[in-house]
Interface confidence: low
């Protein structure tokens, strides 16, 4: 179920799958929610630790049991991912942090009259992920009212420093507030060039596009279909970026599909989940559990309810069925995508709906922390 | 909202505008989306307007002036006014609206979490009131959704300010001693929300106050935590399944 409780002065021991810098516990929780394996997180505010390297540290954690031992650590904040929390799931983060400088690659500097205007500029710039603004009272006069637009390899700051009269925040593109607008078109038989930022396996171009949309550095993508001439590249989804923000070139290429991230869409973003079920397809991955259920929809529901399950395969092979029930293979991988996709099988596959935000899960549930 | 500022898109995605379409169409009250098919508002919004077919509910909007005849709206399937509400009193100022069709959730249209039943222990320090209501006592409805940050005041303090009224435990008050920031006419039924542990909760429903934003006259809100049993009973009995965002 959905757990929204935050544990003050507590730190989860072990289970680390990733770490980054975030300005507060809520942003850390959001990163955990969108990380394919993260179930728990611990955050160290500046006041909680003397080690400058670990200040603002956000530690994403996984656990086979769904929990980890808590150790007392003054000032630390820990909590759960919101993966099963329905409409609470959002990559939108509006807060502005006063007295904090979020470091990254500064690619644009301009003078603006307010931090809100700086945030708006970041939101309306295709490459901007976060920003810092030097206020009217900043100690160095020449930097006052400077708006620095930034990005980083992981989409989070490379460091966060306490600095008076500086205010920082994130782009509001995930809030569907960008003025840029987006290209909804899918280009058949066209491959985009430029820099690959990630490679995943997906069953179709639409899943590829959604993954691109929620990847911090993906601006456009190329998907190689299951009939692509090179077998090892079939179902490969290449997430791409470029200096200009658009593909520098595109090549006509049979059995490829290309398109753009939808992060810059106005008013509506795709849900960060994939609800379609793919008949005759087998998703490979690490086995989490195998259970007998009646029908593929129940298999998907079972996967959704098991928080660590990322995708599933429902087998219809006679040896995998007992009366009306057949085997439901619950699976996971390092990046949340299948490690292989096989066609022509007797069964169906699909993804967990744990990140769908339309669910009627009890998204506001809280559990009192036991002592 | 008096002393407020413009909201931005998706900042308060649970806020809805309750409008009446007779010959002309007008915004009358606010409300809060609490489930795919449920809106929570104030009972007094229906004083003299109990007919559900005259109401139009707009969700996922920021600017009332953007509403045209083509703007989609929800219609009311059922109005459930608290059984103890009386037009002549301020008590039990709470009503549920069941929509004819469920709404999909988006960044601009999604529900607010409800508090735990009888929530008295939580100390809320970051509370906001939103609405399209008057920006001064003798004002007009605003086009852009307004927001204002207002501190909660204790019921004891509130009772001192309203000696002629009974401030019950089922009410919650919010305001500044010096006034200047408050809800006003047209904000009724809308949300008083507080952020706690990174999560927004619906603490109050805008109900009444002496004028608007007056010194030492806080706004009075229906305390949602006190009505959780009623909300759950009505939403469950209506279709056998709780459809709002409710804590366990």
């Amino acid at each position: 179920g959905c757990l929204t409780q935050l544990y003050e002065n507590a730190f989860f021991r072990g289970g680390d799958v990733a770490s980054m810098y975030t300005p507060n516990a809520q942003y850390c929780q959001m990163r955990c929610t969108f990380h394919p394996r993260c179930l728990l997180f611990s955050f160290l505010p500046a006041s909680s630790i003397n080690d400058m390297e670990k200040r603002f540290g956000c530690f994403l954690k996984d656990s086979v049991t769904g929990t980890l031992p808590k150790v007392h650590r003054t000032g630390a904040v820990s909590g759960h991912s919101l993966k099963q929390c329905g409409h609470q799931i959002s990559a939108c983060h509006r807060d502005i942090y006063k007295g904090v400088d979020m470091r990254g690659v500064n690619f644009n500097v301009s003078k603006v009259s307010s931090v809100e205007e700086c945030q708006k500029r970041c939101t309306s710039n295709i490459r901007c992920q976060f920003f810092s603004y030097a206020t009217q009272t900043f100690h160095k006069a020449e930097y006052r009212n400077n708006c620095l637009l930034k990005y980083s390899p992981g989409g989070t700051p490379t460091a966060i420093k306490v600095l008076s009269n500086v205010e920082s925040g994130f782009s509001l593109k995930p809030c569907a507030l960008s003025e840029i607008g987006c290209h909804m078109n899918i280009f058949q038989h066209l491959a985009f060039s430029d820099v690959d930022v990630a490679r995943v396996l997906t069953p179709d171009a639409f899943v590829c596009r959604t993954i691109c949309t929620y990847h911090p550095n993906c601006l456009f993508f190329t998907f190689y279909t299951n009939v692509w001439k090179i077998e090892s590249q079939r179902n490969v989804c290449l997430l791409k970026t470029s200096e200009s923000g658009t593909p520098s070139s595109s090549t006509p290429q049979e059995n490829t599909i290309s398109g753009y991230s939808l992060l810059t869409c106005k008013r509506t973003l795709p849900e960060p989940c994939h609800s379609k079920i793919y008949p005759g397809v087998d998703f490979g991955g690490e086995e989490l559990n195998v259970t007998f259920v009646k029908g593929v929809n129940v298999c998907q529901e079972t996967c959704t309810k098991m928080i660590r399950c990322q995708f599933f395969t429902y087998s219809l092979l006679p040896e995998d069925c007992k009366e009306e029930k057949c085997k439901c293979f619950l699976r996971l991988s390092m990046d949340g995508s299948p490690t292989r996709i096989a066609y022509g099988t007797q069964g169906s596959s699909g993804y967990s709906l744990r990140l769908c935000n339309t669910g009627d899960n009890s998204v506001c549930t809280t559990k009192t922390s036991t002592r | 909202i008096v002393g407020g500022t413009n909201s931005s898109w998706g900042e308060w995605p649970w806020q809805v505008s309750l409008q009446v379409k007779l010959t002309a169409q007008r915004h009358l009250c606010g409300g809060s989306l609490i489930g795919h098919q449920w809106v929570l508002t104030a009972a007094h919004c229906f004083d003299g307007l109990p007919l559900q077919d005259v109401w139009r509910i707009y969700s996922g909007i920021l600017n009332l002036s953007d509403i045209t005849k083509d703007t989609p709206f929800s219609q009311i399937k059922e109005i459930i006014i608290h059984q103890n509400y009386k037009v002549s009193e301020g008590n039990h100022d709470i009503a549920l609206i069941k929509l004819q069709a469920p709404l999909n959730y988006t960044e601009f249209q999604k529900p607010i979490c409800l508090p735990s039943k009888g929530d008295t222990s939580t100390i809320y320090t970051n509370c906001w009131v939103t609405g399209w209501g008057f920006s001064k006592e003798k004002g007009e409805i605003q086009n852009i959704l307004q927001k204002v940050n207002i501190p909660l005041v204790t019921n004891e303090e509130c009772q001192k300010r309203y000696q002629d009224y009974k401030i019950t435990q089922r009410m919650v008050c919010a305001g500044y001693k010096e006034g200047g920031k408050d809800a006003c006419k047209g904000d009724s039924g809308g949300p008083l929300v507080c952020k706690h542990n990174g999560m927004w909760r619906l603490v109050g429903i805008t109900s009444w106050g002496e004028g608007c934003a007056r010194r030492e006259q806080p706004g009075v809100y229906t305390k949602v935590a006190e009505y959780m049993d009623w909300i759950l009973e009505k939403t469950q009995s209506s279709d056998g399944k709780a459809q709002m965002q409710s804590p366990a």
Epitope: - | L22, P50, Y165
Partner: antibody, heavy 122, light 106 residues
């Protein structure tokens, strides 16, 4: 500027009928409970009738119940008082009124029209 | 029905005087009482509502007090512009006016 302008008054015989109008401007008419109040020559004020914002609820003083009908047209920003079976004691200046800031919801009247004179005499 | 009784019906006073008008309700109306001023040939003007709340723009020499059934309107220092008729009005259950108090020059 907020204004209420009554019209329709005049001389009418006992048992006759008259329809008063009150044209509102400068405010969102459909949001407010509207009232009719009258004042007989040299006498005090008497509340006559009230109508809620939608027109769905109407209330009357005992002295006019069954004879007078209050109504409104929100699209025309106009309040009406249909007076039937008029009597000599209905002779008065008739005012329409409303209160602008309606929270709490039981309120006094702070905006009045200039009034229209109704004389019932044979 | 709730009846409102004002006293006195006429009051003679001079500029600078402190003037008090009382209003009695036939049953408790809490603080749901308003005071109006009316000049000949004009519509009434709201002075005070909820027994003691001064309407915006009304001079502070006017004040109201009381609750339940007994109410008073006080003019702390009568000014030339204050010679008029004053009405109380209850709005606890519908609306009823007192019969009025005429304040005239002594």
């Amino acid at each position: 500027e907020v204004q209420l302008l009554e019209s329709g008054g005049g001389l009418v015989q006992p048992g006759g009928s008259l329809r008063l109008s009150c044209a509102a401007s400068g405010f969102t008419f459909s949001h407010y409970i509207m009232m009719w109040v009258r004042q007989a020559p040299g006498k005090g004020l008497e509340w006559v009738s009230g109508i809620y914002s939608s027109g769905g609820i109407t209330v009357y003083a005992d002295s006019v119940k069954g004879r007078f009908t209050i109504s409104r047209d929100n699209s025309k920003n106009t309040l009406y008082l249909q007076m039937n079976s008029l009597r000599a004691e209905d002779t008065a200046v008739y005012y329409c009124a409303y209160r602008r800031s309606g929270v709490p919801r039981r309120d006094a009247f702070d905006i009045w029209g200039q009034g229209t004179m109704v004389t019932v005499s044979s | 029905d709730i009846q409102m009784t004002q006293s006195p019906s006429t009051l003679s006073a001079s500029v600078g005087d402190r003037v008090t008008i009382t209003c009695r309700a036939s049953q408790s109306i809490s603080s749901w009482l308003a005071w109006y001023q009316q000049k000949p040939g004009k519509a009434p003007n709201l002075l005070i509502y909820k027994a003691s709340t001064l309407e915006s723009g009304v001079p502070s020499r006017f004040s109201g007090s009381g609750s339940g059934t007994e109410f008073t309107l006080t003019i702390s220092s009568l000014q030339p512009d204050d010679f008029a008729t004053y009405y109380c009005q209850q709005y606890n259950t519908y609306w009823t006016f007192g019969q009025g108090t005429k304040v005239e020059i002594k």
